[in-house]
Every structure is written in structure tokens, then in C-alpha cells.
Interface confidence: low
């Protein structure tokens, strides 16, 4: 076959070839930031000629042209300056209102290097209508000037700009315009990840977290799709695998989808994930009808097994078929559950389409979306039950109109995006479900957010460091766990009755500053000297305390609460039914067997997770008996005198050699990690052997080196009494 000519340089830019100079190869131009290539690409035809999509002359000279932002076509009830036909990158436009009108939105906007204006549409409004003046975004023309209930406004874009968002909006009874704000964009424009992540993330986080659907968030983003905590989400991930997607880019599609899956499974909802790859035909790698779709490990495994070569015989982009396979899946599930049942009707559906190009075979994907809307009975009342996110990747062949047509349109939200490359996509998925950015109403316990450049406290955001300074007696170091915005749970033995609040230092999130203490609340049954007369020098029963802080903690990536047993938060974290009892939680977290758990220890100023097994089955007795080897307990006749029912036991060499706690670990949480969440089941209290002499952990420890922890299920009445104003406990 002939090869295509090589005289295709672009003035001021560069180009890449997907398959060299051979027929079928896609030549992609790129330019420095602030410039865009014209044309964007050429395709090597089988005739050995370059074809330029949409061009009349096939080999017009490729050039890098300056990016420009669209000018306002009309601005009501005010003036804007300067008045230009279009604006250069870095150029500003300023807005002022006439008397009697108030400016809403951004008074000054700047043209960004991606051809998009920063800020928000400026509107001069006098508040006269039932709905606020919807404004006219830059580059748009609006018809319709009445803003009463039921009134409609229509938008179109000037010249060669592309409209994204709703071309028609209606003023609804609740004073909110239907659909989403229309934006006129240059065909070559794209979105920055830092804009997409919050837009996607806010929508998703509310779906996952459980805010009131009518409640306004701080960012005033209005209605956000949401899953009732008892509800169910079907998430459908559609990954483009057509010829124009390189193998490396497909890997990043997979990685991004994995990130999404990993995050979504750690929220408090029941979720099923479908994975579909597509080119000329779709391939369903995981269906929501498969029980494994509810299992994060299985879903990620099916993603990892997705093979780029699965579609090598069919290289087109059949978005219709991909969406139709979602429709067929929904149809099967509806027939299985029954169309009229709550089980079917209460499922929310979110589709994420990752594509690098426009659909080029199989008919209009909009038809499949219409079928999906029909089967889900999507109307104004059920609008929350479907969200379609259409994400185009690569500025090359992505069709804004098609993405906009496929993406959902909801007030204050965006569902269609174009990103510059797969790196940007990866970054969006990395940041879109950042728990620290979620609103205060979504206070998820036991949640962590891992970062490569993150600190130890990103991985253990509940961990608190406690230090008690005793003049002339040195100081005591302990750990604790943040359990609410005002309370840290720790061990009572870290303190004496003589310790004053000002001598107790608590820090969280790895911060250097110490928190002010209001009071330390001891369990009333704790008495270290309670059995001195019986020859037991130290008695650690009920060794728990709560530190009440003077000021409310500000939750963020490095400061978050751990989950406590028998709270509603833990029911949701474990995705158990809302009717779950305290006893059922106990059976879930502390079954009568060896239970994998962890504690957090500080080694050489680094926090490290240590995996241990709670001996709660046949090894429990031997674990507890080893308490006789503890200093001062060798004379105890009946070991239950010191190991009361309040204790959990770890350590020893079976089923595995457990690491041991050190002195400074006291008061820290003993944690069960389940369903991507962290639930505290114990408080580290005391150990049989000090394996940490000279601050160094000894490598070899005896088999009887056991550790004892206060079982939180055994001190629940006290926890509930002290924390009932800040946590919702189940009936005990």
C-alpha cells in the first residue's frame, strides 16, 4: 500500500502519527499553550493521500493560530468593556449594571488559554421575575425575556461557536430554571482538569453521601443527584477502545475507571458497577446483573483484564451500541426485579462515557439515551434517577455537539466535558471524590484518601498524638482517635488524676499546633489501683477516656473521624441495612474467630499500619492466659482477675506472627478495615512484653508477647452517654 507524503509540518507546532506514514494512520497536530492547530488532524487514506476532516482543500497548510475567547453578543441592562469581536488569551472583559439592577456573577472575566472564560456569567438582575434572570453567556443569543412560572427562553450561539448545555430552559415552579446553563465555546476549546474535577465531584459526592436533595450546598450548586443511604446505585463505565485510542491511553482509561471504582466503593451506598469496552461493537466485561458487580475486587479485576486487543478487528466508534448494551442490561434487570417493584424503581443509574471521538457508526447514540430515559421513566419527578456523564478526551475528533446531546442537563451542573488528554482525565478521577472537599453534611467516618505525596495523616486521618507533660517526671506519650469534631478517644491510663488540662497536649493531622483541652472524661469504673490489695499492682479494666476539645476540629484530608461500633455511621460504612442492630454489627465486626485488624504505630517519626489478628475464637483462651507473663501478674492465680471480659487479645505467632504495640501506642485505636472503611473496635491498653526497649522494636519476640485492648462493644453505654449529642448510636 502506498504511504502518505511527509510534507505535513505545522508552522510553530508539532505533530504525531498513530501508525507512521501508512494508510489508516492519524496525524495529530499540537501547538504551544494559547495556540490551537488548524487543521487539528489529517487521516492517511488507502490511496496514499492525506484527508483533512471537514476541509474543502485537503492539503491546506497547517498552522498554529492564537486561541481567542468569544465576545458577548448582547448584555442586558448594563455595559461591558472593552468591546471587541473576540478576546485574546489573558484579555479581560468587565461588566457594569445600570441603576436599579444588581450584578450577579463575575464583574471581570479573563480569557484562559483553553479558549474558555474564567468566572461565571455576569447578569444584571432586578429580581422581578419568578425565576432569576438566566443571563446570556458570552457568545450566545437569547430569545425570551419573560421569567415567570412556565416561561421559556431559547439560546443559540453566534458564528461558528458550539453550544453546550441546554438550548431551551423553562422557569419551574420552584423558581429554578430547568436544564443547565448554555455556554458557547470555540470548537477547539477544552476543559482544564481543575474545573472538571469539582464539577463532576460535587455531583457525584452528593449522590454518594446523602444530603437532602433540596438542600443548597455551600457552593450553591443546587440540586445534586443523591442516593438515599438505603438506596442503590448502578454505575455503568463505558470505555472507548477504538483505533484512535492508543494502547497507552486505553490503559489510562482503565486506571481512571479503577480510581473511580475504588473511591465509589468506600462511600455509604450499595453500588453495582458495569464495565463495557467498545469500538465497532461493545464488550460487557461486568454486568450489574452479576453479583460480582457489587464486589470492588471483582470489578477492578475485570477492569484489569480488559484487553486493548479485544477490539482489534473492529476499530470504529459505535457509541450507540455501547449505550444500547446499557439499555439491554437495564431491561433485563427490570424484568428480573419487576417493573412495578420498589427494588427496581429506587435504583439510581449513572453512566460515565469515556471516549476520544465522535460516534462514526451504528446510528445516533442519542436514540439509545432516549430508550434509557424511557425505560427508567425519567421525567421531572424522576430526574434524579439518571445521570449521564459524557467525557471526551483529546481535542482532536471529539464532537462537542454529540457529547452535549448525550450528557444530562441539570440546573447548576455540567455533565459534558472535553479534556486535553488522558493525563488530564486521570487527574480528574484522582480528585473528583476528594472527601475533604465534600460538604459538612457528608461527614463520613473511617474514610481515607491516599496520595503519593500525601502524609501519614492522609492514610490515618483519625490518628491523634497525645503528650502529657509532668514537671520533674518527664512526659507520657500516647495515641488516640478522633471520633467527632470535639472528641478524641484514648486510654485512661495515659493520665493521672493530678494531670491538669493545660499539661495535656493533643495534636491531629500531623499539625504542630496543640489543641486546647476542655476536659478529660474517664470511664467511671476505671481504677488502676483497684486490685492493689489483691496483689495486682496495675489493673486496666475499663481503660478508656474521652478528651473533650475546647474548639471544633475542622475536618479535611488529614483530619477525619474513625467509625465507632453501634453507630448509624458504621451501619452505613459497612453498607448494612438501616434496620441493623448493635448485636448484628458486633457479629459483623467481631465474629468468634481470628479477626484481621490493625493498629497504627509511630516508628522513627513515621506512622505505620501494623496488621494483627484479634484472637476471638479457639485461640482466645491461650492468648488471655499469656497475661501471666506480664510483669507483676506472675502471682495471679486466676487470669480472669486481670483479663476481664472488657479486653480483646492480639499478639503471638498464630495464625501469623503479630507485631506488638509499644508504650507510645497506648490509647490508639484497634481497627477493623472492612469495605474500604475503618472501624475502631478497641483501645490499645497494655502488653505482656515490652518489645520496644531503647525505642527500637526487637526483631525476635517471644510467642507469649500479647497485647490487650479495651473492647469498645463492652463500654458502649458510657460512650453513648458521652457522645449521644454528636453521634447517632443504635439502641444498645
Amino acid at each position: 500500500a502506498p504511504s502518505c507524503p511527509q510534507n505535513v509540518n505545522i508552522s510553530g507546532g508539532t505533530f504525531t502519527l498513530s501508525h507512521g506514514w501508512a494508510p489508516g494512520s492519524l496525524l495529530t497536530y499540537s501547538c504551544p499553550q494559547g495556540l490551537y492547530p488548524s487543521p487539528a488532524s489529517r487521516l492517511c487514506k488507502s490511496s496514499g493521500q492525506w484527508q483533512t476532516p471537514g476541509a474543502t482543500r485537503s492539503l491546506s497548510k497547517a498552522v498554529c493560530k492564537p486561541v481567542r475567547c468569544p465576545a458577548p453578543v448582547s448584555f442586558e441592562n448594563g455595559i461591558y468593556t472593552p468591546r471587541l469581536g473576540s478576546y485574546p488569551v489573558g484579555g479581560n472583559v468587565s461588566f457594569e449594571c445600570e441603576d436599579g439592577f444588581i450584578l450577579r456573577g463575575s464583574p471581570v472575566r479573563q480569557c484562559r488559554p483553553n479558549g474558555m472564560w474564567d468566572g461565571e456569567t455576569a447578569v444584571c438582575d432586578n429580581g422581578a421575575g419568578h425565576c432569576p434572570n438566566p443571563g446570556i453567556s458570552l457568545g450566545a443569543v437569547r430569545t425570551g425575556f419573560r421569567f415567570g412560572h412556565g416561561d421559556k427562553v431559547r439560546y443559540r450561539c453566534s458564528s461558528n461557536l458550539v453550544l453546550t448545555g441546554s438550548s431551551e430552559r423553562e422557569c419551574q415552579g420552584n423558581g429554578v430554571w430547568s436544564g443547565t446553563e448554555p455556554i458557547c465555546r470555540q470548537p477547539y476549546s477544552y476543559d482544564f482538569p481543575e474545573d472538571v474535577a469539582p464539577a463532576l465531584g460535587t455531583s457525584f459526592s452528593h449522590m454518594l453521601g446523602a444530603t437532602n436533595p433540596t438542600q443548597k450546598t455551600k457552593e450553591s450548586l443546587g440540586r445534586k443527584i443523591q442516593i438515599q443511604r438505603s438506596g442503590h446505585l448502578n454505575l455503568y463505565l463505558l470505555l472507548d477502545c477504538s483505533q484512535s485510542v492508543s494502547e497507552n491511553d486505553f490503559l489510562i482509561f482503565k486506571e481512571s475507571a479503577s480510581l473511580m471504582v475504588d473511591r465509589i466503593f468506600s462511600f455509604e451506598i450499595n453500588v453495582s458497577v458495569a464495565i463495557i469496552t467498545f469500538a465497532s461493537e461493545p464488550k460487557v466485561l461486568m454486568s450489574v446483573l452479576n453479583d460480582n458487580s457489587r464486589d470492588m475486587t471483582e470489578v477492578i479485576s475485570s477492569l484489569e483484564n480488559a484487553n486493548y486487543k479485544d477490539h482489534e478487528n473492529g476499530t470504529g466508534t459505535n457509541t450507540y451500541a455501547a449505550l444500547n448494551s446499557v439499555y439491554l442490561m437495564m431491561n433485563n434487570q427490570m424484568r428480573l426485579l419487576g417493573m412495578e417493584t420498589m427494588a427496581w424503581q429506587e435504583i439510581r443509574h449513572a453512566i460515565i462515557l469515556l471516549t476520544d471521538g465522535k460516534s462514526n457508526m451504528g446510528g445516533s447514540p442519542k436514540t439509545a439515551v432516549d430508550h434509557i430515559r424511557e425505560i427508567l421513566n425519567i421525567n421531572q419527578k424522576r430526574n434524579d434517577y439518571l445521570d449521564i456523564y459524557a467525557i471526551g478526551v483529546g481535542k482532536l475528533d471529539v464532537d462537542w455537539r454529540e457529547l452535549n446531546e448525550l450528557g444530562s442537563k441539570k440546573d447548576g451542573e455540567r455533565h459534558a466535558f472535553i479534556l486535553q488528554d488522558t493525563k488530564a482525565l486521570h487527574q480528574v478521577f484522582e480528585h473528583m471524590l476528594d472527601v475533604s472537599k465534600l460538604t459538612d453534611t457528608i461527614c463520613l467516618c473511617g474514610m481515607v484518601w491516599e496520595h503519593r505525596k500525601g502524609t501519614d495523616y492522609h492514610k490515618q486521618p483519625w490518628q491523634a498524638k497525645i503528650s502529657v507533660i509532668r514537671p520533674s517526671k518527664g512526659h507520657e506519650s500516647c495515641m488516640g482517635a478522633v471520633v467527632s469534631e470535639y472528641f478524641v478517644l484514648t486510654a485512661a491510663h495515659c493520665f493521672t488524676v493530678d494531670d491538669k488540662e493545660h499539661s495535656i497536649k493533643v495534636s491531629v493531622g500531623g499539625e504542630k499546633r496543640d489543641l486546647e483541652i476542655e476536659v478529660v472524661l474517664f470511664h467511671p469504673n476505671y481504677n488502676i489501683n483497684g486490685k492493689k490489695e489483691a496483689g495486682i499492682p496495675e489493673f486496666y479494666d475499663y481503660d478508656v477516656a474521652l478528651i473533650k476539645l475546647k474548639n471544633k476540629l475542622k475536618y479535611g484530608q488529614t483530619i477525619r473521624p474513625i467509625c465507632l461500633p453501634c453507630t448509624e455511621g458504621t451501619t452505613r460504612a459497612l453498607r448494612l441495612p438501616p434496620t441493623t442492630t448493635c448485636q448484628q454489627q458486633k457479629e459483623e465486626l467481631l465474629p468468634a474467630q481470628d479477626i484481621k485488624a490493625l493498629f497504627v504505630s509511630e516508628e522513627e517519626k513515621k506512622l505505620t499500619r501494623k496488621e494483627v489478628y484479634i484472637k476471638n475464637g479457639d485461640k482466645k483462651g491461650s492468648c488471655e492466659r499469656d497475661a501471666q507473663y506480664a510483669p507483676g501478674y506472675d502471682k495471679v492465680k486466676d487470669i480472669s482477675e486481670v483479663v476481664t471480659p472488657r479486653f480483646l487479645c492480639t499478639g503471638g505467632v498464630s495464625p501469623y506472627a503479630d507485631p506488638n504495640t509499644c508504650r507510645g501506642d497506648s490509647g490508639g485505636p484497634l481497627i477493623v478495615h472492612k469495605r474500604s472503611r475503618f472501624i475502631q473496635v478497641g483501645v490499645i491498653s497494655w502488653g505482656v512484653v515490652d518489645v520496644c526497649k531503647n525505642q527500637k522494636r526487637q526483631k525476635q519476640v517471644p510467642a507469649h508477647a500479647r497485647d490487650f485492648h479495651i473492647n469498645l462493644f463492652q463500654v458502649l453505654p458510657w460512650l453513648k452517654e458521652k457522645l449521644q449529642d454528636v453521634l447517632n448510636f443504635l439502641p444498645l
Epitope: P113, F192, Q420, D421, K423, R452, K453, T455, G510, K606
Partner: antibody, heavy 118, light 111 residues
Framework: EVQLVQSGAEVKKPGASVKVSCKAS????????MDWVRQATGQGLEWIGD????????GYNQKFKGRATMTVNKSISTAYMELSSLRSEDTAVYYC???????????WGQGTLVTVSS | DNVLTQSPDSLAVSLGERATISCRAS??????????MHWYQQKPGQPPKLLIY???NLKSGVPDRFSGSGSGTDFTLTISSLQAEDAATYYC?????????FGQGTKLEIK
């Protein structure tokens, strides 16, 4: 004024280890990552790894993982880079470099020549 | 790893003339709206010196005859009017992700 002062030249035998120090002054030591870069005579620059002095978290070039160890002593504002199992091809000038807010190497030590020879 | 390839390996330019050095990355170094590409100058016996950060930002104290441009994978360092003290080796370096890598260097001589 920001200054990074490195320890003196070293001559080592193959198989031995070397530990290069880098004392920082003129800024808050824990505020910026410290990186280590090496340069063989007449050759280009090669990134070894970085350390966050505040949290002591490290990132390594895979090529040096297992052989290079980066540590800090916050109390004396000093970063260390130890390279073990030395070979003749490890003969190079080793630089410490402080990252700025943009992850660029804004300040460099004067370099430490490490010669590995039997 | 992201491989950075500089071109040319060496060049000779007359005093007062314009010098241009290119750096191509095997993967895009752009993220968060910034290009994590930096340029350094190194003279014999001295450590490198930062000239340009984030592709196009001049480090304070560096003469404004130095400029940087580019985005994604292709970057350029330009010296608008070469001075005698500009004879050195120039390196590009990315910090988009680990591991950070350098270009192989371009030796600039006065013609």
C-alpha cells in the same frame, strides 16, 4: 539567603557505602522537598529521589531503589543520601537540590565528588 | 519513565544571535493547567542554575533574554541575543510525576 552546603569528597572501594550530607540554611528546612541528583564526569544529570523533610516521606528513581536511602535530621536542618553496594559507575558528583513551590530545583549544593575505585 | 530528548546535542551561535534549544517529552508534562517543565544552565565545575520554571516563567535574577515556551510534550528555550557568558550546557527537566527526569543536555558554544 538560601544555602546548601554539602560534605567533602569521598573515595570508596567497590561494594562499600557512602553517605553524603547536605546542610540547609536560610529557610525553614521542613517547608520544601530536598532532592538528590548525580552527574558522572562529562555526562548529564540523573535524578536519584526526593524526601519531604516534614513527613520524611520519600520518592525514589526505581534505578536506585534498594541502594539509595534518603534521610533527614530536622534538628540540624540536614539531609543525607546514602548509596550502598558502590560500583565504579557510581563515580560522580552528587548534588542536593531544594525544590521550590513549582517542583523545580531552585537551589543547589556545591556538589560532592564520590570516587569508586579499587 | 518520561524520556526527555533535547535537540540539538550541541550548537554554535554567534554573539548577539538567537539560540534555540528544543526538548521533547515522551509523555505530556501538563497537569492542573501548568506544564511541569523547567530549564537549567550549567557551566563547568558548577552546579546547575534554574533559568525557567513551569515552561515559560523566568526565575527572578535571570536576564530577560532567556525565555521558554511550549506545552504538553514540546518545549523550547530561547536566548534572544547571545552573550559570551551564555556559553554553557542547558538541560530541560520535568516534575510532572515520579521519577523526575532530565534531558541529555545541549552544549551551547560561541561561534
Amino acid at each position: 539567603e538560601v544555602q546548601l552546603v554539602q560534605s567533602g569528597a569521598e573515595v570508596k572501594k567497590p561494594g562499600a557505602s557512602v553517605k553524603v550530607s547536605c546542610k540547609a540554611s536560610g529557610y525553614t528546612f521542613t517547608d520544601y522537598n530536598m532532592d538528590w541528583v548525580r552527574q558522572a564526569t562529562g555526562q548529564g544529570l540523573e535524578w536519584i529521589g526526593d524526601i519531604n523533610p516534614n513527613y520524611e516521606s520519600t520518592g525514589y528513581n526505581q534505578k536506585f531503589k534498594g541502594r539509595a536511602t534518603m534521610t533527614v535530621n530536622k534538628s540540624i536542618s540536614t539531609a543525607y543520601m546514602e548509596l550502598s553496594s558502590l560500583r565504579s559507575e557510581d563515580t560522580a558528583v552528587y548534588y542536593c537540590a531544594r525544590e521550590d513551590d513549582h517542583d523545580a530545583f531552585a537551589y543547589w549544593g556545591q556538589g560532592t565528588l564520590v570516587t569508586v575505585s579499587s | 519513565d518520561n524520556v526527555l530528548t533535547q535537540s540539538p546535542d550541541s550548537l554554535a551561535v554567534s554573539l548577539g544571535e538567537r539560540a534555540t534549544i528544543s526538548c521533547r517529552a515522551s509523555k505530556s508534562v501538563r497537569t492542573s493547567g501548568y506544564n511541569y517543565m523547567h530549564w537549567y544552565q550549567q557551566k563547568p565545575g558548577q552546579p546547575p542554575k534554574l533559568l525557567i520554571y513551569l515552561a515559560s516563567n523566568l526565575k527572578s535574577g535571570v536576564p530577560d533574554r532567556f525565555s521558554g515556551s511550549g506545552s504538553g510534550t514540546d518545549f523550547t528555550l530561547t536566548i534572544s541575543s547571545l552573550q559570551a557568558e551564555d556559553a554553557a550546557t542547558y538541560y530541560c527537566q520535568h516534575s510532572r510525576e515520579l521519577p523526575y527526569t532530565f534531558g541529555q543536555g545541549t552544549k551551547l558554544e560561541i561561534k
